[in-house]
């Protein structure tokens, strides 16, 4: 029986050209984590494996950095980075847990404009 839950950073926005940290946290399970995958839609961004460490997909090597922890840092953001990101925890004996994050990358002026109007 799968008892674990994944907490994610949820829906987040960031400025074009900036960076963002994607984070997921698996809790409420004693299952052993063996690997964590980070994916964007159907593209693999990175893997953190218990025995092999981190692997960053070659096409993202210049813009993706592992960490902090099991999170992933996306750098030099473009509007094309807008979309769904998934953290996939492979565990034993539970199986797979998946968390979803939606990232919206905003044009600089739009992000600044939005921030101004969030201040009470």
């Amino acid at each position: 029986m799968m008892t674990g839950t994944i907490e994610t950073t949820g829906n987040i926005s960031a400025e074009k050209g900036g960076s963002i940290i994607l984070q997921c946290h698996l809790s409420s399970t004693t299952a052993q984590v063996t690997q964590v995958n980070w994916e964007q839609q159907d593209q693999l961004l990175a893997i953190c494996n218990a025995d092999l460490g981190w692997h960053i997909s070659p096409s993202f090597k210049d813009r993706v950095a592992p960490g902090p922890g099991l999170g992933l840092t996306l750098q030099s953001l473009t509007v094309n980075d807008t979309g769904e990101y998934f953290c996939i925890y492979h565990t034993y004996p539970d199986g797979t847990y998946t968390g979803r994050i939606f990232l919206e990358v905003l044009e600089s002026s739009v992000a600044e404009h939005g921030a101004r109007f969030q201040i009470p």
């Epitope: 984070q23 809790s27 494996n49 960053i56």
Partner: antibody
Framework: QVQLQQPGSELVRPGASVKLSCKAS????????MHWVKQRHGQGLEWIGN????????NYDEKFKNKGTLTVDTSSSTAYMHLSSLTSEDSAVYYC??????????WGQGTTLTVSS | DIVLTQSPATLSVTPGDSVSLSCRAS??????LHWFQQKSHESPRLLIN???QSMSGIPSRFRGSGSGTDFTLSINSLETEDFGMYFC?????????FGGGTKLEIK
């Protein structure tokens, strides 16, 4: 098996610099973060910073930004920490530690740095 | 920076006793909290990662719990080899930080 080898001790003069080493073996050096941690006189642990050998990315605690510089030599699977303008406050045990899926799972034995004239 | 506060600073107990060590974070770190044991003149050893995951080879008497800001390391039926320093550490955000430690000593 995973090993992080550090020299046992270093003795340096005040005002001088030192380059501490941490030689990794038993795993793919470029796939794990390497961290450096300071411990004075058997007291608490202080995180200095980290480096990802696969890309050379570094992070530092603000307190150590002007004190330490982290580098790696991937050909020899060795991590280095260069400490400058040494004072007695820098006398401590310095550990390197690997971070992977299970956090700081392997540590070096530590190098005891003594700054004395 | 995230501050980790460990309590008590020192705990004097007898072998066979059970103890709970506390680590409190200045802000939520979800479950990115790890526990280390350090004996005199030795390197720290990872006991528990991500709040509750026991490392391979660690005796079952060590158990980690908590999330958010409050975490506990429980040790059931202490053995003489368990005495030493215990540190918590967060890896939720850089800079990573350690707690000040709890010294577990024989009464």
């Amino acid at each position: 098996q995973v090993q992080l080898q550090q020299p046992g001790s270093e003795l340096v003069r005040p005002g001088a610099s030192v380059k501490l080493s941490c030689k990794a073996s038993g795993y793919t050096f470029t796939s794990y973060w390497m961290h450096w941690v300071k411990q004075r006189h058997g007291q608490g642990l202080e995180w200095i910073g980290n480096i990802f050998p696969g890309s050379g990315i570094t992070n530092y605690d603000e307190k150590f930004k002007n004190k330490g510089t982290l580098t790696v030599d991937t050909s020899s699977s060795t991590a280095y920490m260069h400490l400058s303008s040494l004072t007695s406050e820098d006398s401590a045990v310095y550990y390197c530690a690997r971070e992977g899926l299970y956090a700081f799972d392997y540590w070096g034995q530590g190098t005891t740095l003594t700054v004395s004239s | 920076d995230i501050v980790l506060t460990q309590s008590p600073a020192t705990l004097s107990v007898t072998p066979g006793d059970s103890v709970s060590l506390s680590c409190r974070a200045s802000q939520s770190i979800r479950n990115s909290l790890h526990w280390f044991q350090q004996k005199s003149h030795e390197s720290p050893r990872l006991l528990i990662n991500y709040a509750s995951q026991s490392m391979s080879g660690i005796p079952s008497r060590f158990r980690g719990s908590g999330s958010g800001t409050d975490f506990t390391l429980s040790i059931n039926s202490l053995e003489t080899e368990d005495f030493g320093m215990y540190f918590c550490q967060q890896t939720n955000s850089w800079p990573y930080t350690f707690g000040g430690g709890t010294k577990l000593e024989i009464k």
